[in-house]
Interface confidence: low
């Protein structure tokens, strides 16, 4: 996905504006691509990404990718179409309102990814196991 902040301003200088909130209107996501991160050994982290973007396509959701190797930790925040794989993985949790990190198998690094479908939901990434789809409270939030 082309970073949508290149194409569309998200400040008050827009000619007109966004979201009466109708179905499949483009999502608002944090979109800083890959940046170094200090997020480590925490139940949850903020992205520290200052760019909120209107996703380029109405079907796109918010995605965050946390990676740790011997040298550094990075956090990637983007919009992405859940019908397409990202980093070779399917976005299984795209309908979730919260970005619940799940570990994926990648050689030579620790790799977590999450996706979600509420505005700026990839700003707060959650690693804690208490948040999962067997949690009735989370299901209530998703399907209310």
């Amino acid at each position: 996905t082309i970073p949508p902040h290149v194409q569309k301003s998200v400040n008050n200088d827009m000619i007109v504006t966004d979201n009466n909130g109708a179905v499949k209107f483009p999502q608002l996501c944090k979109f800083c691509d890959v940046r170094f991160s200090t997020c480590d050994n925490q139940k949850s982290c903020m992205s520290n990404c200052s760019i909120t973007s209107i996703c380029e396509k109405p079907q796109e959701v918010c995605v965050a990718v946390w990676r740790k190797n011997d040298e550094n930790i990075t956090l990637e925040t983007v919009c992405h179409d859940p019908k397409l794989p990202y980093h070779d993985f399917i976005l299984e949790d795209a309908a979730s309102p919260k970005c619940i990190m799940k570990e994926k198998k990648k050689p030579g690094e620790t790799f977590f990814m999450c996706s979600c479908s509420s505005d700026e939901c990839n700003d707060n990434i959650i690693f804690s196991e208490e948040y999962n789809t067997s949690n009735p409270d989370l299901l209530l939030v998703i399907f209310q």
Epitope: V10, N12, M14, V16, T17, D18, N19, N20, G21, A22, V23, K24, F25, Q27, L28, T52, P58, Q59, A95, P97, K98, S117, S118, D119, E120, C121, D123, V141, I142, F143, Q144
Partner: antibody, heavy 122, light 107 residues
Framework: EVQLVESGGGLVQPGGSLRLSCAAS????????MTWVRQAPGKGLEWVSV????????YYADSVKGRFTISRDNSKNTLYLQMNSLRAEDTAVYYC???????????????WGQGTLVTVSS | DIQMTQSPSSLSASVGDRVTITCRAS??????LNWYQQKPGKAPKLLIY???SLQSGVPSRFSGSGSGTDFTLTISSLQPEDFATYYC?????????FGQGTKVEIK
Amino acid sequence: EVQLVESGGGLVQPGGSLRLSCAASGFTFDIYAMTWVRQAPGKGLEWVSVISGSGGTVYYADSVKGRFTISRDNSKNTLYLQMNSLRAEDTAVYYCARRGQYRDIAGGTDYWGQGTLVTVSS
Amino acid sequence: DIQMTQSPSSLSASVGDRVTITCRASQSISSYLNWYQQKPGKAPKLLIYAASSLQSGVPSRFSGSGSGTDFTLTISSLQPEDFATYYCQQSYSTPPTFGQGTKVEIK
């Protein structure tokens, strides 16, 4: 049960100011973008403004840009619309509405308040 | 801005009638169209989203169809509580825009 209750409407002179509030209950307020939509007497619906769940991103219709300010207090589950430099053409019922969060699941502006009337007249 | 044009602007019908309201967009909006019902003195109510999906709790006599620029709201058998004004709204591009409304009155 989802409820949205607007308040703060009334009669104001041209050039004056008014602050509308919308108290929300029955849902997780801070993950929903919230909008204001207005309807002039006997007329159709006009979208006014939206604010993202965190409050970090806001947008306005051309007709109100620079005069209206949308904000929210997530600790109080309340949405606001500060209206300055009011004009006669701003006279309308103002509705706050919840943006349907899950674009493939729910969609649409699915819950609306009952509206509050703003009358701008000398 | 995308212009939304509804027709007719008003219609008279009887209980039990099949009623059809059309909405035309000034450019293609795929299936990103919603229908709302509004009764006098009340807030709008979402009926149909994504052109043809029925919102939870809405009676099955309401249905929507169409794609691209031409859309239809159909009430298969008009009930007394259906006399109201109906609005279409596109959600394809900014700003979201509404049609001018169709008032359904008792014949």
